[in-house]
């Protein structure tokens, strides 16, 4: 069956070496155990995080992000995940795009991340 | 290769002036947070200010000790940066580096430029 | 003002052995602990990030451990290029950094 997916609608804001959360789901809600999910950037398409037959594909992701994503998989049973980013970077600021693909079928959504430093509001010494 | 280089460096007397820059290369510099630092021989590195990616608006914050008498600024379409310092002290002697900063730390550093007050 | 501590001052030791580096910070910085190492006439370098993390390129027998206050650097099989000064700086107040840790050969 054809579902759409969904982010957040709104930037997800982090303060960099912190963790970011990007939300991402599938409408209608149902079961995404068995599909392929996955982030990608643009340009070049590089892959910051896949999951696949039931598995991250670490060996597929860009060398950026190595060792610093997490998919939270919870709510996957109802078509809900998160990709959590750990040590957030100025460069990892921009645009990413969710995907699901349940066999050849394949629909995905666009999160924005923005990153900022936590001194705006702070006089320093 | 990512590649920051401080210039403009020199002796000047105290309550003088001074204009560093930092020319950088390999990287979309607009993208970045670019740090100043300091250091003098045998003691730890000392942060002066840094100034904020286009992004986050591209503004300043300094240390209090340079406040009002320094001010950082950036040419994103010249890859440059620049510190200009006034009112210059003798304990404004130092090292200068322009620094990288992507994770929040001090990522890459330019090799230093030595600023000497004195009469 | 937040204050970094390291000790010693000085650490002797001979290649092959490790070194264990240490980091105090006079409050809570959480994770944002970054570790550096600089040569005579040379620019600090970053090792570590975010108290484990380490940076791009740096050899896997430099590790960070610890979170809040206190802090961890070490290197495990000294090679002669390691003996060196290294410098905790936290960033979760602004920026300070640490005195220094001499790495000298014994």
């Known amino acids: 069956g054809q579902f759409r997916v969904i982010g957040p609608g709104h930037p997800i804001r982090a303060l960099v070496g912190d963790e970011a959360e990007l939300p991402c789901r599938i409408s209608p809600g149902k079961n995404a155990t068995g599909m392929e999910v996955g982030w990608y950037r643009s340009p070049f398409s590089r892959v910051v995080h896949l999951y696949r037959n039931g598995k991250d594909q670490d060996a597929e992701q860009a060398p950026e992000y190595r060792g610093r994503t997490e998919l939270l998989k919870e709510s996957i049973g109802e078509g809900k995940v998160a990709l959590r980013i750990q040590n957030v970077r100025f460069s990892d600021e921009g645009g990413y795009t969710c995907f699901f693909r349940d066999h050849s079928y394949q629909e995905e959504a666009a999160v924005e991340l923005k990153v900022e430093d936590p001194f705006y509001w702070i006089n320093p010494g | 290769e990512v590649q920051l280089v401080e210039s403009g460096g020199g002796l000047v007397q105290p309550g003088g002036s001074l204009r560093l820059s930092c020319a950088a290369s390999?990287?979309?510099?607009?993208?970045?947070?670019v740090n100043w630092v300091r250091q003098t021989p045998g003691k730890g590195p000392e942060w002066v200010g840094f100034?904020?990616?286009?992004?986050?608006?591209?503004?300043?914050e300094y240390a209090a000790s340079v406040k009002g008498r320094f001010t950082i600024s950036r040419d994103d379409s010249k890859n440059s940066l620049y510190l200009q310092m006034s009112g210059l002290k003798t304990e404004d002697t130092a090292v200068y580096y322009c620094?990288?900063?992507?994770?929040?730390?001090?990522?890459?550093w330019g090799p230093g430029v030595l600023v000497t007050v004195s009469s | 003002e937040l204050v970094m501590t390291q000790s010693p001052a000085t650490l002797s030791l001979s290649p092959k052995e490790t070194a264990t580096l240490s980091c105090r910070a006079s409050?809570?910085?959480?994770?944002?602990l970054a570790w550096y190492q600089q040569k005579p006439g040379q620019a600090p370098r970053l090792l570590i990030y975010?108290?484990?993390t380490r940076a791009t390129g740096i050899p896997a027998r430099f590790s960070g451990s610890g979170y809040g206050t206190d802090f961890t650097l070490t290197i495990s099989s000294l090679e002669p290029e390691d003996f060196a000064v290294y410098y905790c700086?936290?960033?979760?107040?602004?920026?300070?950094f640490g005195q220094g840790t001499k790495l000298e050969i014994k």
């Open positions: 620094i990288l900063s992507d994770t929040g730390a001090f990522d890459v």
């Open positions: 390999g990287f979309t510099f607009s993208d970045y947070y």
């Open positions: 100034i904020r990616n286009k992004a986050n608006g591209g503004t300043a």
């Open positions: 409050q809570s910085v959480r994770s944002y």
């Open positions: 975010g108290a484990s």
């Open positions: 700086q936290q960033y979760s107040s602004w920026y300070t």
